[in-house]
């Protein structure tokens, strides 16, 4: 399984249909500014085995996704965009999906880091709670897309790792 | 390793233009602003503009906007700082620094060594 | 725009000694605010960042407090290489602004 090659070149496409999202220029929204407190630990590690590293990385591009089919969220963004954006992100959850049940067999480990997993949930569930405060306002959702470009690249180096691990 | 690079010290004369750069490495060039601050001999640090280099959109102090042009070329990860006709009042050390846009991160944490600008007749 | 006013302008200390700065905004700022070091000849360097956050690489004795319009920069221990001057910046809102200075000369 060639998940980081791939799965690399998915982030990268999603990197860009982000960027090209921003509706308001993100000047006006300084004093929006929030710390999410990005669950870098989880990411930091080298004690993970692959299919777990697969399901911690899966766990963000499913609430990422999350984020992005929400109702609140459509009335925000380009429709053809955010409909690139989530196809994007489907196809890696489907291609992560395949490679962790390859791994199966390999591993003797548990398929699941359960800590790390909470970790990235309780992250979104940051990020949801601080757009409800907000009540969705532009500002906050150009926040909180500059917030996930941030994670998808330093998670963008995780992926990097684990490839050179192999 | 973060760096900032700027050009070298310019000496013009009154009405001449100047194009100053500053030149990011170490890090992903469009992922951060690029602000630009002028301090004037014996004063103190003054905020000039910022640009996002992933588009190119631009934001001006007052105090500034229409005496400068901020641009940039995220192709060789470069912000330019310019002026179309120089006045003495220009003469200022001119220093880019690195900023993190919405991101939950410090403000202005690496800085350039800064372009010395002498305009003189 | 958001002035920003640093005091005292100057100040003499004795390494060893502690060492207070304040920064007053005219307005609420919250804790977007942030403080550089400056050393003749040199760019400026952050110290601290969002009020209280100690950059990486900056030694423990510079610490920061304050919220809404006040706020600190104290130098617990001043060393030799602390002498130099200091700003505080407000970050919440464009134009961006930077206090007046403070300059930390040796008695």
């Known amino acids: 399984c060639d998940l980081p090659q791939t799965h690399s070149l998915g982030n990268r496409r999603a990197l860009i249909l982000l960027a090209q999202m921003g509706r308001i220029s993100p000047f006006s929204c300084l004093k929006d500014r929030h710390d999410f407190g990005f669950p870098q630990e989880e990411f930091d590690g080298n004690q993970f085995q692959k299919a777990q590293a697969i399901s911690v990385l899966h766990e963000m591009i499913q609430q990422t996704f999350n984020l992005f089919s929400t109702k609140d969220s459509s009335a925000t963004w380009e429709q053809s965009l955010l409909e690139k954006f989530s196809t994007e992100l489907n196809q890696q959850l489907n291609d992560m999906e395949a490679c962790v049940i390859q791994e199966v067999g390999v591993e003797e480990t548990p398929l699941m880091n359960v800590d790390s997993i909470l970790a990235v949930k309780k992250y979104f569930q940051r990020i949801t709670l601080y757009l409800t405060e907000k009540k969705y306002s532009p500002c906050a959702w150009e926040v909180v897309r500059a917030e996930i470009m941030r994670s998808f690249s330093l998670s963008k180096i995780f992926q990097e790792r684990l490839r050179r691990k192999e | 390793e973060v760096q900032l690079v700027q050009s070298g010290a310019e000496v013009k004369k009154p009405g001449e233009s100047l194009k100053i750069s500053c030149k990011g490495s170490g890090y992903s060039f469009t992922s951060y602003w690029i602000g630009w601050v002028r301090q004037m001999p014996g004063k103190g640090l003054e905020w000039m503009g910022i640009?996002?280099?992933?588009?190119?959109?631009?934001a001006y102090s007052p105090s500034f906007q229409g005496q400068v042009t901020i641009s940039a070329d995220k192709s060789i990860s470069t912000a330019y700082l310019q002026w179309s006709s120089l006045k003495a009042s220009d003469t200022a050390m001119y220093y880019c620094?690195?900023?993190?846009?919405?991101?939950?991160?410090?403000?202005?944490?690496?800085w350039g060594q800064g372009t010395l600008v002498t305009v003189s007749s | 725009d958001i002035q920003m006013t640093q005091s005292p302008s100057s100040l003499s200390a004795s390494v060893g000694d502690r060492v207070t700065i304040t920064c007053r905004a005219s307005?609420?700022?919250?804790?977007?605010l942030n403080w550089y070091q400056q050393k003749p000849g040199k760019a400026p360097k952050l110290l601290i960042y969002?009020?209280?956050s100690l950059q990486s690489g900056v030694p423990s004795r510079f610490s920061g407090s304050g919220s809404g319009t006040d706020f600190t920069l104290t130098i617990s221990s001043l060393q030799p290489e602390d002498f130099a001057t200091y700003y505080c910046q407000q970050s919440i809102d464009f134009p961006l602004t930077f206090g007046q200075g403070t300059k930390v000369e040796i008695k």
């Open positions: 307005q609420s700022i919250a804790e977007f």
């Open positions: 640009i996002d280099p992933s588009d190119s959109d631009t």
């Open positions: 620094a690195r900023h993190p846009g919405l991101n939950w991160a410090p403000d202005f944490d690496y």
């Open positions: 969002f009020a209280s």
